[in-house]
Each structure stands twice: as structure tokens, then as C-alpha cells.
């Protein structure tokens, strides 16, 4: 049994840390393998997590972790029964993937006006809270090449777009999704799409 | 909220025994490792001793060795230090505290142990 | 055993003005990833030990910013940029680099 493709892990910044791997052959990850993870301070203790299947030959691993600080390493241990497969260490705050906007929402009924708002993953005390920017991604089911993307620079979890540069009487979906410039972060999975049909009133023609 | 909560101090005649406990909540407690300090009244911090999130590692300073003894029983989130043959001077508070990035990350109220005749 | 020796032992302050308190080891506490093994603690009068500093430098969640923690190796320093009523007690550094944790003996700050 070996290693084919080495463990990469991404931090959530807040208490989660997800490595994933390809083994040499179809394996059964939960049964066969452990990952040991231990944070490199004194009095710390290896901590174990059990892999789950992702694909034939692929593994991923849910570490729980406290709050990240930069200053966190971890040592990571790949284990199958006594052969010790990998060795290597993970830096969360230097591979952090933000968490997920959600309760995005879409409000139809200021005038002519658009407003989505949706809700900032991380609580007011962890240090990603303030440092999200977002984008957010509007396409009509009806016609795939009607695809936008709007960039959220601001703080507020908010985007407010006039009706009228989306067509009237078709129906959208949008989604939304994070990154953190500080971190040189990935950007996050994108949220659950929310749907609505859009309409508004023409203006009259002028002739 | 991260919560410690001591108790078993008391007044004890010098060379008897006492056991102190700290009942700990709000966070999974089997995951860190966990120290006894003490305060002698009006004086300093001065660490006990420690012990790893299994309990399979124990630590303590030298001068408590072989008199103190610290241990954990993970199903109950209990902390506890067996203390035999007091002295005068260990006569303090004794404060469990939660270890995180090698220092302490919360800590309890405290429990007074006095040692006299 | 790392012996941390605190100075000043009393620090008399006046609301608003800064404060520093000193710590040194007898051994460096600077580690291969570059940082130094060191907490500062402060003990409100009455009340248990709370976290301020950790890693030297590091302010602890809910810290205010007023308080700093700087320098490396053997020699440390906290500092209050404006000392308010609500800062009294006594300030402790620790070294977390290896058993036996050691404590420095103490800085008492109070009000002028």
C-alpha cells in the first residue's frame, strides 16, 4: 500500500481542517488508514482522524482544530496499522479556504432595485470576519450564455444591482461565494443557489 | 465558554492527605492537556504539575514528585490532583488551568488548601 | 530549570500614561519557526489569572490593543500604552518552552 498522491489540506480559519489524498489502488479509507495530526507546542497531544472514502483510491480527512492562529503547525502522520506511509506538516493559516457565504437571499421588492444579502460564515470574534470580500455569480436558466459576476470589494454582505440590467420576465438563480485578500486565501465553495423570477416595469419609449 | 471549576480545598492537619477536583465543561475536554498552579498567599504563580489530553503523560515540578499526584478521568471532565504528606507551605490556592500553544488558555476560580495544626 | 526574572516589582501609574514591564530568561525561548515561547498573564485583584500575551507578541481574544508584547530570545517586554483604572494587578510573564513551566516573580501595577 502507498501514498500516490500526497495529502493537501486547507484550513477554514476557524475549526476545521480538510486533507485529501490518492492512494496506489482502491482502498478503504476508514477501515485501513489512520491520520495522526499533532500541534507543535508543548504539552500537545497527536489527535486521530479517520479518513473516508473519497473516490476508489482517494481519501479525505476532517481534523477538528481551535481557533487558527498563524503561529499553529501541525505535524500530520499518515498511518496504515503499524506502516507509516507520509509524513509531512501543515501551516493552516498559509492554506486557509473560507467557509461559505449563506441565507443568501434575494429581495424583489424595492423598486426597480435588486438587494441580495447573505451571511457572513465566520462570527464577529474570528479574524476572517472582517476581511471576506465576495463574488457573486447571476446566470438565467433560460439562456446559459446570460452568466455575470459581480465583485463584492466592500465589507457588507450585500449587492444591490437595478432590475433592468437583467432581462424581465425570466427566472435567475444566483450563488455567492468568500475569499480573504489578507490570507492570499482560495476562494470558497460557492453558496446554495437561490432562485427568482425577475420583473419589472419597462420605461416607456420616447418617440 | 470554556468553564474550570475547582473544589476539595479545605483545612488539613500537616502530613494528611486531600484531594482537589476540577470539573470542566464547554469544551471537549479529552483534547487538552490540563495544570494544577498554586498561589501561596501574597506570593507568586508557581506550577504543579500537568497532564496530556489521554492522561497517558504526566509532568510535575521537582519539588512535587512523588508527593502529588495529578490525574483525569475524561468520561467525567474531571481534573484531579491527590496531594499526601502537606506541609505548612502548601498552604495556597490550588487553580486548574487549560492548556493551549503550550500556556493557559482559561483557567479556574481556585480552591484554598490550608495546611495547619 | 528556566528561571524568568520580572522588573520592575512595582509599577506606580498614572491613569493615561503608558506602563512596561521587563522579563528576561536564563535561556532563549525562541523557537526554529520564530517564535518565542513566552505568555503574559495579568491577576486582577480577587480574581484568577487571565491570558493577555501569548507567543510574545500575540494579544489574546478580547484583549484590548492598548497592550503589546514585544521582544526575543532572552529579553521581553509588555507594555500599556495608556494605563487605565481597570489594568490594576499584578502582571506575570511565563515560559512555555519546556517543564517545568516557570513563572517570573511578578509586577505589581497600581494606581498613583
Known amino acids: 500500500m502507498k501514498v500516490l498522491q500526497e495529502p493537501t489540506c486547507v484550513s477554514d480559519y476557524m475549526s476545521i481542517s480538510t486533507c485529501e489524498w490518492k492512494m496506489n489502488g482502491p482502498t478503504n479509507c476508514s477501515t485501513e488508514l489512520r491520520l495522526l495530526y499533532q500541534l507543535v507546542f508543548l504539552l500537545s497531544e497527536a489527535h486521530t482522524c479517520i479518513p473516508e472514502n473519497n473516490g476508489g483510491a482517494g481519501c479525505v480527512c476532517h481534523l477538528l482544530m481551535d481557533d487558527v492562529v498563524s503561529a499553529d503547525n501541525y505535524t500530520l502522520d499518515l498511518w496504515a496499522g503499524q506502516q507509516l506511509l507520509w509524513k509531512g506538516s501543515f501551516k493552516p493559516s498559509e492554506h486557509v479556504k473560507p467557509r461559505a457565504p449563506g441565507n443568501l437571499t434575494v429581495h424583489t421588492n424595492v423598486s426597480d432595485t435588486l438587494l441580495l444579502t447573505w451571511s457572513n460564515p465566520y462570527p464577529p470574534d474570528n479574524y476572517l470576519y472582517n476581511h471576506l470580500t465576495y463574488a457573486v455569480n447571476i446566470w438565467s436558466e433560460n439562456d446559459p450564455a446570460d452568466f455575470r459576476i459581480y465583485n463584492v470589494t466592500y465589507l457588507e454582505p450585500s449587492l444591490r444591482i437595478a432590475a433592468s440590467t437583467l432581462k424581465s420576465g425570466i427566472s435567475y438563480r444566483a450563488r455567492v461565494r468568500a475569499w480573504a485578500q489578507c490570507y492570499n486565501t482560495t476562494w470558497s465553495e460557492w453558496s446554495p443557489s437561490t432562485k427568482w423570477h425577475n420583473s419589472y416595469r419597462e420605461p416607456f419609449e420616447q418617440h | 465558554e470554556v468553564q474550570l471549576v475547582e473544589s476539595g480545598g479545605g483545612l488539613v492537619q500537616p502530613g494528611g492527605s486531600l484531594r482537589l477536583s476540577c470539573a470542566a465543561s464547554?469544551?471537549?475536554?479529552?483534547?487538552?492537556?490540563v495544570s494544577w498552579v498554586r498561589q501561596a498567599p501574597g506570593k507568586g504563580l508557581e506550577w504543579v504539575s500537568a497532564?496530556?489530553?489521554?492522561?497517558?503523560?504526566?509532568y510535575y515540578a521537582d519539588s512535587f514528585k512523588g508527593r502529588f499526584t495529578i490525574s483525569r478521568d475524561n468520561s467525567k471532565n474531571t481534573l484531579y490532583l491527590q496531594l499526601n504528606s502537606l506541609r505548612a507551605e502548601d498552604t495556597a490556592v490550588y487553580y486548574c488551568?487549560?492548556?493551549?500553544?503550550?500556556?493557559?488558555w482559561g483557567w479556574g476560580q481556585g480552591t484554598l488548601v490550608t495546611v495547619s495544626s | 530549570d528556566i528561571v524568568m526574572t520580572q522588573s520592575p516589582l512595582s509599577l506606580p501609574v498614572t491613569p493615561g500614561e503608558p506602563a512596561s514591564i521587563s522579563c528576561k530568561s536564563s535561556?532563549?525561548?525562541?523557537?526554529?519557526?520564530?517564535?518565542?515561547?513566552l505568555d503574559w498573564y495579568l491577576q486582577k485583584p480577587g480574581q484568577s489569572p487571565q491570558l493577555l500575551i501569548y507567543?510574545?507578541?500575540f494579544r489574546a481574544k478580547g484583549v484590548p490593543d492598548r497592550f503589546s508584547g514585544s521582544g526575543s530570545g532572552t529579553d521581553f517586554t509588555l507594555k500599556i500604552s495608556r494605563v487605565e483604572a481597570e489594568d490594576v494587578g499584578i502582571y506575570y510573564c511565563?515560559?512555555?518552552?519546556?517543564?517545568?513551566?516557570?513563572f517570573g516573580g511578578g509586577t505589581k501595577v497600581e494606581i498613583k
Open positions: 464547554g469544551f471537549t475536554f479529552s483534547r487538552y492537556a
Open positions: 535561556q532563549s525561548l525562541l523557537e526554529g519557526q520564530g517564535y518565542n515561547r
Open positions: 488551568a487549560r492548556h493551549l500553544r503550550g500556556g493557559f
Open positions: 497532564i496530556g489530553g489521554s492522561g497517558g503523560r504526566t
Open positions: 507567543l510574545g507578541s
Open positions: 511565563m515560559q512555555t518552552s519546556e517543564t517545568p513551566l516557570t
